[in-house]
Interface confidence: low
């Protein structure tokens, strides 16, 4: 009779992490008589995976029911495969032997590689708000995936982005793997509604993308714009001071109105208009009784956005002056016509 | 559990039939599904079997070429696409569930009443 | 490709006997075997899987055994029920499935 053979037909075995791999091995006989045993690796160092004779192994199950005599089919089923699986197994034919039994013959192995979805990715941005004109950098990262192959992409609005820098990691062989990629954004003032986009595309994606995003409203810091105007008189003795905060955000404001370097009045935005770009305009009116001032009166608005230092802008108040509509020296910007219809 | 076929008929030799099999009383996607065919006064003879979800298709040397499985999981029904017919594909069509444990054993644990093709000139 | 030859073509036995149906693989299959029953003008019903475990609502007087290459369909005590063409099936490895040439159980 010909010697014993041990047969394992796959070269390599693919499975997706969560699944089940079924690693094949027949013998081509019974003799001699002996029990099978299933080692991930070879050598010293190898580990066994499952042993027909004794063991408990909660993850193995046979293919067949291997306590029968005439049985020569030893595939097992490994459950629940994750990429720490990842490795060749053999199949090892033992004779009966005293004490021990001894290895008779081993099958040429089965690489078993394990194939598992990236974890979403996470995007990250700058810890502190940035103005526009100003470039930063966004970090992408995504864990768990097998095998090392992965593309990632960056967006802002639907148009991908060209500045990044991609790592994954390790470099060498590794059951799983992760990706950290750093992209520049250069941002407008338009992007308080604007997006950053991270997109992974994976063998085990199926041709459907991961995406991670964040937007920049968490991001960008928009500075508002400053006009003080001068309004028609109410009364005999009274002026109407306005100043206009325009294209701001975040909303965090505080306002505070100095006459001749003197607080007057402290408010904080409430009831503010919001822009079609996310932005914020706000409007804030000091009443000045002019009949008590004897000179002319310095009336400064004086801002303080999102915890960054104060801007200001001032308005000449002539005590003399006719009553009638006067409009500052300093004006950042013309009125917007969404404010007209404040008054 | 119940299977219905449809589509059978009578076709001259090079033309083509679509096969339908109308699944009920299972969840259908969980399992493998064939179209098994039998000549008048003849054995059984498998045609062609597809996986659960579609991707993996595997037919006869006969059909191969000519015969096309696909399934729709979304209404439970199982299709042949036959072309080219031949007279020696006259036979009863039947569509048949896979009843086994393991995802490469392959053994009819229902059957439906089959569906008559007749291809002839 | 694996053969399986049944024998004999057909058998011929009387209500209440005992019936013994060969089907012989050219090759090992294991238990990889499933036996079916088909009644004139009726599709096939499954009988016997994995060589002997009985499907679902079968009565115990069918009886698959064998392994290997030789396995056997009993029917302890014949019912009038029971006359029809049986064909046995491997699963051991396909494609393609096949299934052996069918024994006829008719009334003697």
């Known amino acids: 009779e010909e010697e014993l053979q041990v047969i394992q037909p796959d070269k390599s075995v693919l499975v997706a992490a969560g699944e089940t791999a079924t690693l094949r091995c027949t013998a081509t006989s019974l003799i001699p008589v002996g029990p099978i045993q299933w080692f991930r690796g070879a050598g010293p160092g190898r580990e066994l995976i499952y042993n027909q004779k004794e063991g408990h192994f909660p993850r193995v199950t046979t293919v067949s029911d291997l306590t029968k005599r005439n049985n020569m089919d030893f595939s097992i089923r490994i459950g629940n495969i994750t990429p720490a699986d990842a490795g060749t197994y053999y199949c090892v034919k033992f004779r009966k032997g005293s004490p021990d039994d001894v290895e008779f013959k081993s099958g040429a192995g089965t690489e078993l590689s394990v194939r598992a979805k990236p974890s979403a990715p996470v995007v990250s941005g700058p810890a502190a708000r940035a103005t526009p004109q100003h470039t930063v950098s966004f970090t992408c990262e995504s864990h768990g995936f097998s095998p090392r192959d992965i593309t990632l992409k960056w967006f802002k609005n639907g148009n991908e982005l060209s500045d990044f820098q991609t790592n994954v990691d390790p470099v060498g062989e590794s059951v799983s793997y992760s990706i950290h990629s750093t992209a520049k954004v250069v941002l407008t003032r338009e992007d308080v509604h604007s997006q950053v986009i991270c997109e992974v595309a994976h063998v085990t994606l199926q041709g459907d993308p991961l995406r991670g995003t964040a937007n920049l409203s968490e991001t960008i810091r928009v500075p508002p714009t400053l006009e003080v105007t001068q309004q028609p008189v109410r009364a005999e003795n009274q002026v109407n001071v306005t100043c206009q905060v325009r294209k701001f955000y975040p909303q965090r404001l505080q306002l505070t109105w100095l006459e001749n370097g003197n607080v007057s009045r402290t408010e904080t935005a409430s009831t503010v208009t919001e822009n079609k770009d996310g932005t914020y305009n706000w409007m804030s009116w000091l009443l000045v009784n002019v009949s008590a001032h004897r000179d002319d009166v310095k009336l400064t608005c004086q801002v303080e956005h999102d915890g960054q230092p104060a801007v200001s802008k001032s308005h000449d108040l002539k005590v003399s002056a006719h009553p009638k509509e006067q409009g500052s020296n300093t004006a950042a910007e013309n009125t917007g016509s969404n404010e007209r219809n404040i008054y | 559990v119940q299977l219905v076929e449809s589509g059978g008929g009578v076709v001259r030799p090079g033309e083509s039939l679509r096969l339908s099999c109308a699944a009920s009383?299972?969840?259908?996607?969980?399992?493998?599904m064939s179209w098994v065919r039998q000549a008048p006064g003849e054995g059984l003879e498998w045609v062609s079997l597809?996986?659960?979800?579609?991707?993996?298709?595997y037919y006869a040397d006969s059909v191969k070429g000519r015969f096309t499985i696909s399934r729709d999981n979304s209404k439970n029904t199982l299709y042949l696409q036959m072309n080219s017919l031949r007279a020696e594909d006259t036979a009863i069509y039947y569509c048949?569930?896979?009843?086994?444990?393991?995802?490469?054993?392959?053994?009819?644990?229902?059957w439906g009443l089959g569906t008559p093709v007749t291809v002839s000139s | 490709e694996i053969v399986l030859t049944q024998s004999p073509g057909t058998l011929s036995v009387s209500p209440g006997e005992r019936a013994t149906l060969s089907c012989r693989a050219s090759?090992?299959?294991?238990?990889?075997l499933a036996w079916y029953q088909q009644k004139l003008g009726q599709a096939p019903r499954l009988l016997i899987y994995?060589?002997?475990t009985r499907a679902t609502d079968i009565p115990d007087r069918f009886s698959g055994s064998g392994s290997g290459t030789e396995f056997t369909l009993t029917i302890s005590s014949l019912q009038s029920e029971d006359f029809a063409v049986y064909y046995c099936?491997?699963?051991?490895?396909?494609?393609?499935?096949?299934f052996g040439g069918g024994t006829k159980v008719e009334i003697k």
């Open positions: 597809i996986t659960t979800n579609g991707d993996g298709a």
């Open positions: 994995d060589a002997n």
């Open positions: 090759q090992n299959v294991r238990s990889d």
């Open positions: 009383g299972f969840t259908f996607s969980n399992y493998a």
């Open positions: 099936q491997h699963y051991y490895d396909w494609p393609p499935v096949t």
């Open positions: 048949a569930k896979d009843g086994a444990a393991h995802y490469y054993d392959i053994f009819f644990d229902y």
